[in-house]
Interface confidence: low
């Protein structure tokens, strides 16, 4: 029943232009363009997806015209590698050109950077914003998918195209306003801070598929869907992940054109076949396609069948259960996983992985054992301490986040992250242990029955950005060792670590606590950074430091810094005023 | 939008007890933070005591011991006046943040009852 299977096209580049239209069509070039070559000026990418349009209109017109059978990876790979200045801008990504299809695509893949240098994005005056956005409405919106993709090369294309489309109507709706800033600031905040989220969210879809493979991609699939869809039966529910499956892999593998015809067609399937789904879906299905398919994929679960019989029938108590896995293991696992899935809204995709998997290697031995069945007898039993970890663990901190407030809570967070990591970059440690912070105000406020799929997947997402940055520049063995051991057990993994003893403090540097007049410009969020940033050094110097001498530092430094910015000579005083708390701080730590 | 609405004020004897209520109504309001501030005839309000959404509570320090807070349910919180004295007279406010988490600086709440007045007299 799979939705995908399509007649063959003689020319695939007109498939997805008739399919996609020219808009989307030309934006999808441009994203894929500049997700692959991060570094490239606007008008580069914008030459080369035209040319490529002519190109795929000629195709259109007579699908036997010369290349035109060509397959996208060999036309977009071509086309890519004209750039006159490919060697000296990217280096061996060059090299990627004497290679021939697959393995050059492959090798733009291993050459994307999720840290690319490039200049933080400055947002102009809202009335420069609004002269660009009525001169050229298209450049403007371009450019705007051309910055996101070239700093999110991961970045899920066809929902980029959502977020653009709500950035026009955001453009559209506030430059007429009588306050143009009160109605066009706190949208682009949100449509920012959603984006770096989806951004995160779909990097760890990516890794899941890049680096533990389609069997891991396909689990997580089957235990999300599932919770969503506890109405839907499991043959149901394994056609959604198949096609899922198929969409991601091929979003993550640069293949942007073929993803968003086939997310497309997954939206349309699923709401025609709402009733066999979900009860959830119909508030969605009335929206238009790019709206449509993000409000699936945000859909809140529907509710669970009543009296849904106990698992452990199926799943201990009967005498067939190793036959049963012998004869389709995975299936008789997904099985396992859907249907506890389907009861437990409660639980974090990750742990019901985590239980899956216990369950998976109980039974691998137990099957082999003289008994199986006395062997198997008490698998539930095992699933009571994993189930608790992240319950207490989100209890404690919770609690720890009420008390402290947000800014404290990911204070806390960087000390404990940077005693156990010293070696990780501290640009790295203060993005990833503030990330780590906001799980606070995002899922302690949620009930008990929500707060663990909120946090510990939170949690995954967040993981997976200090996974795929430490890959960059290895630095840390028990980052390595964490990230790539076990996808579900990352989390556990990196909770566990103590206080690395091995590390050896890093020499004192006066200027790194040196600080200027420029701090008191600078907004809420970014002197906090300038703070995080001097507590993460302060751990280095002094990785045996109480939580108590931490403060008090901490709390100086806050004092200090707030005493110059009101200070007549406020660069005098974080001169002077500096030394002091350097060598204060120094004499109270032991440096 | 959030409305906050004040009880259990009135007119006790020095060393005698009250119990004040806040009921919160409006839309949905579990993820609030709720306090207590008191207010002096030509003074700034005083803040007296909060609650976090998951019912951390905090009390100023100098009513420590004769002032307690509590959430009875997710939208009311209690707060129970004990021993009092008559410089304890003045009206009381109910707040709440559009956040969780507790502050004692009264610019940080967003939402305000229309307070109840304490008198503490022979």
């Known amino acids: 029943r799979g939705v995908f299977r399509r007649d063959a096209h003689k020319s695939e580049v007109a498939h997805r232009f008739k399919d996609l239209g020219e808009e989307n069509f030309k934006a999808l070039v441009l994203i894929a363009f500049a997700q692959y070559l991060q570094q490239c000026p606007f008008e580069d990418h914008v030459k080369l997806v035209n040319e490529v349009t002519e190109f795929a209109k000629t195709c259109v017109a007579d699908e036997s015209a010369e290349n035109c059978d060509k397959s996208l990876h060999t036309l977009f790979g071509d086309k890519l590698c004209t750039v006159a200045t490919l060697r000296e801008t990217y280096g061996e990504m060059a090299d990627c050109c004497a290679k021939q299809e697959p393995e050059r695509n492959e090798c733009f893949l291993q050459h994307k950077d999720d840290n690319p240098n490039l200049p933080r994005l400055v947002r102009p005056e809202v009335d420069v914003m609004c002269t660009a956005f009525h001169d050229n409405e298209e450049t403007f919106l371009k450019k705007y998918l051309y910055e996101i993709a070239r700093r999110h090369p991961y970045f899920y294309a066809p929902e980029l195209l959502f977020f653009a489309k709500r950035y026009k109507a955001a453009f559209t709706e506030c430059c007429q306003a009588a306050d143009k800033a009160a109605c066009l600031l706190p949208k682009l905040d949100e449509l920012r801070d959603e984006g770096k989220a989806s951004s995160a969210k779909q990097r760890l879809k990516c890794a899941s598929l890049q680096k533990f493979g389609e069997r891991a991609f396909k689990a997580w699939a089957v235990a999300r869907l599932s919770q969503r869809f506890p109405k839907a039966e499991f043959a149901e529910v394994s056609k959604l992940v198949t096609d899922l499956t198929k969409v991601h892999t091929e979003c993550c593998h640069g293949d942007l054109l073929e993803c968003a015809d086939d997310r497309a067609d997954l939206a349309k399937y699923i709401c025609e076949n709402q009733d066999s789904i979900s009860s959830k879906l119909k508030e969605c299905c009335e929206k238009p396609l790019l709206e449509k398919s993000h409000c699936i994929a945000e859909v809140e679960n529907d509710e669970m069948p009543a009296d849904l019989p106990s698992l452990a029938a199926d799943f201990v108590e009967s005498k067939d259960v190793c036959k049963n896995y012998a004869e389709a293991k995975d299936v008789f696992l997904g099985m396992f996983l859907y249907e506890y899935a389907r009861r437990h809204p409660d639980y974090s995709v990750v742990l019901l992985l985590r239980l899956a998997k216990t369950y998976e290697t109980t039974l691998e031995k137990c099957c082999a054992a003289a008994d199986p069945h006395e062997c198997y007898a008490k698998v539930f039993d095992e699933f009571k301490p994993l189930v608790e970890e992240p319950q207490n663990l989100i209890k404690q901190n919770c609690e720890l986040f009420e008390q402290l407030g947000e800014y404290k809570f990911q204070n806390a967070l960087l000390v404990r992250y940077t005693k156990k990591v010293p070696q990780v970059s501290t640009p790295t440690l203060v993005e990833v242990s503030r990330n780590l912070g906001k799980v606070g105000s995002k899922c302690c406020k949620h009930p008990e029955a929500k707060r663990m799929p909120c946090a510990e997947d939170y949690l995954s997402v967040v993981l997976n950005q200090l996974c795929v940055l430490h890959e960059k520049t290895p630095v840390s063995d028990r980052v390595t060792k964490c990230c790539t051991e076990s996808l579900v057990n990352r989390r556990p993994c990196f909770s566990a670590l103590e206080v690395d003893e091995t590390y050896v403090p890093k020499e004192f540097n006066a200027e790194t606590f040196t600080f200027h007049a420029d701090i008191c410009t600078l907004s809420e969020k970014e002197r906090q950074i300038k703070k995080q940033t001097a507590l993460v050094e302060l751990v280095k110097h002094k990785p045996k430091a109480t939580k108590e001498q931490l403060k008090a530092v901490m709390d100086d430094f806050a004092a200090f810094v707030e005493k110059c910015c009101k200070a007549d000579d406020k660069e005098t005083c974080f001169a002077e005023e500096g030394k002091k708390l350097v060598a204060a701080s120094q004499a109270a730590l032991g440096l | 939008d959030v409305q906050l609405v004040e009880s259990g004020g009135g007119l006790v004897q020095p060393g005698q007890s009250l119990r004040l209520s806040c009921a919160a109504t409006?839309?949905?309001?579990?993820?609030?933070?709720m306090a207590w501030f008191r207010q002096f005839p030509g003074k700034e309000r005083e803040f007296v005591a909060a609650?976090?959404?998951?019912?951390?509570g905090y009390v100023a320090d100098s009513m420590r011991g004769r002032f307690t807070i509590s959430r009875d349910t997710k939208d009311t919180m209690i707060l129970r006046l004990s021993s009092l004295k008559r410089e304890d007279t003045a009206i009381y406010y109910c707040?709440?943040?559009?956040?969780?988490?507790?502050?004692?600086?009264?610019?940080?709440?967003?939402?305000w009852g229309h307070g109840t007045q304490v008198t503490v007299s022979e």
């Open positions: 707040a709440a943040r559009k956040t969780s988490t507790t502050a004692t600086e009264a610019t940080m709440y967003a939402y």
């Open positions: 409006g839309r949905s309001f579990t993820t609030n933070a």
């Open positions: 609650i976090s959404w998951g019912g951390l």
